[in-house]
């Protein structure tokens, strides 16, 4: 069950996000998430993962890129990029949208 919390050994990760108590956290794995909200600059958040490991396997899109790793402070120096948007000439038709 991907929603069940992991109860294995914990790893220490760099924590840089609006959800961090301090500069490090302890979790089942480390995460880096790059998110771009509509009309805003992308923001990169680092932290710990305990639930929803399936997010680690998601492919990057133009709005989000999710990276996971499993060793001490492994998320500290990771930088992510978002998938480039397709140029208009290559986009499929959007009739009726």
């Amino acid at each position: 069950d991907p929603v069940k919390p992991s109860r294995g050994p914990l790893v220490t990760c760099t924590c840089e996000s609006p959800h961090c108590k301090g500069p490090t956290c302890r979790g089942a794995w480390c995460t880096v998430v790059l998110v771009r909200e509509e009309g805003r600059h992308p923001q990169e958040h680092r932290g710990c993962g305990n639930l929803h490991r399936e997010l680690c396997r998601g492919r990057p899109t133009e709005f989000v890129n999710h990276y996971c790793c499993d060793s001490h402070l492994c998320n500290h120096n990771v930088s992510l990029v978002l998938e480039a948007t397709q140029p208009p000439s290559e986009q499929p038709g959007t009739d009726g949208q």
Epitope: V3, K4, P5, E16, S17, P18, H19, C20, K21, G22, P23, N50, L51, H52
Partner: antibody, heavy 113, light 111 residues
Framework: EVQLLESGGGLVQPGGSLRLSCAAS????????MSWVRQAPGKGLEWVAN????????NYVDSMRGRFTISRDNSKNTLYLQMNSLRAEDTAVYYC??????WGQGTLVTVTS | QSVLAQPPSASGTPGQRVTISCSGS????????VYWYQQLPGTAPKLLIY???KRPSGVPDRFSGSKSGTSASLAISGLRSEDEADYYC???????????FGGGTKLTVLG
């Protein structure tokens, strides 16, 4: 869009009980720790309690431990605060917050005889 | 009495730069991140600064945060009338195992 909507506030007599609810939407509720924070009329913010993502860890401010209980139902995307043995000094607006960024608009609890 | 100490009031004129201080201890500001919230009259608090000095998307760069030792400060440059609000600092406290807030600073924009 992240939304947190509190309900369950109202008028209660000293010694009475209330259960506050906070309905969350616009994000994966089960991925975030949640908090309750209160604000007495004309006063500052006071943290009440928090709960981790799966509900296995809870922390309370000392003055409310034993009287207040925080819980969550991830299947319903809802956070709760059960408040017992209420006192006049518990009168406040109670905010539900996603740690530590988004806040609901609050629900007013008034304890008076 | 709040665990984190803030001045009760601050003021400035439009265009000015104002700074609000927040003083704590080794168990909160000294070892954990500082957050700043803005509360406009009659509304819920809004996150302005997280992780000592980072702004969420949508918060103007007129707002900046800093931390040194067990103290922190919020600076607002190019002050505007809409900045008139209450400002709160917050941090996790390892000794209390809970979140602590400053008492709040009421910012008045003069003129």
């Amino acid at each position: 869009e992240v939304q947190l909507l509190e309900s369950g506030g109202g008028l209660v007599q000293p010694g009475g009980s209330l259960r506050l609810s906070c309905a969350a939407s616009g994000f994966t509720f089960s991925s975030y720790a949640m908090s309750w924070v209160r604000q007495a009329p004309g006063k500052g913010l006071e943290w009440v309690a928090n709960i981790n993502q799966d509900g296995s860890e809870k922390n309370y401010v000392d003055s409310m431990r034993g009287r207040f209980t925080i819980s969550r139902d991830n299947s319903k995307n809802t956070l709760y605060l059960q408040m017992n043995s209420l006192r006049a000094e518990d009168t406040a607006v109670y905010y539900c917050a996603r740690e530590f960024d988004y806040w609901g608009q609050g629900t007013l609890v008034t304890v008076t005889s | 009495q709040s665990v984190l100490a803030q001045p009760p009031s601050a003021s400035g004129t439009p265009g000015q730069r104002v700074t609000i201080s927040c003083s704590g201890s080794s168990s909160n500001i000294g070892s954990n991140y500082v957050y700043w919230y803005q509360q406009l009259p009659g509304t819920a608090p809004k996150l302005l600064i997280y992780g000592n000095n980072k702004r969420p998307s949508g918060v103007p760069d007129r707002f900046s945060g800093s931390k040194s030792g067990t103290s922190a400060s919020l600076a607002i440059s190019g002050l505007r009338s809409e900045d008139e609000a209450d400002y709160y600092c917050a941090a996790w406290d390892d000794s209390l195992n809970g979140r602590v807030f400053g008492g709040g600073t009421k910012l008045t924009v003069l003129g």
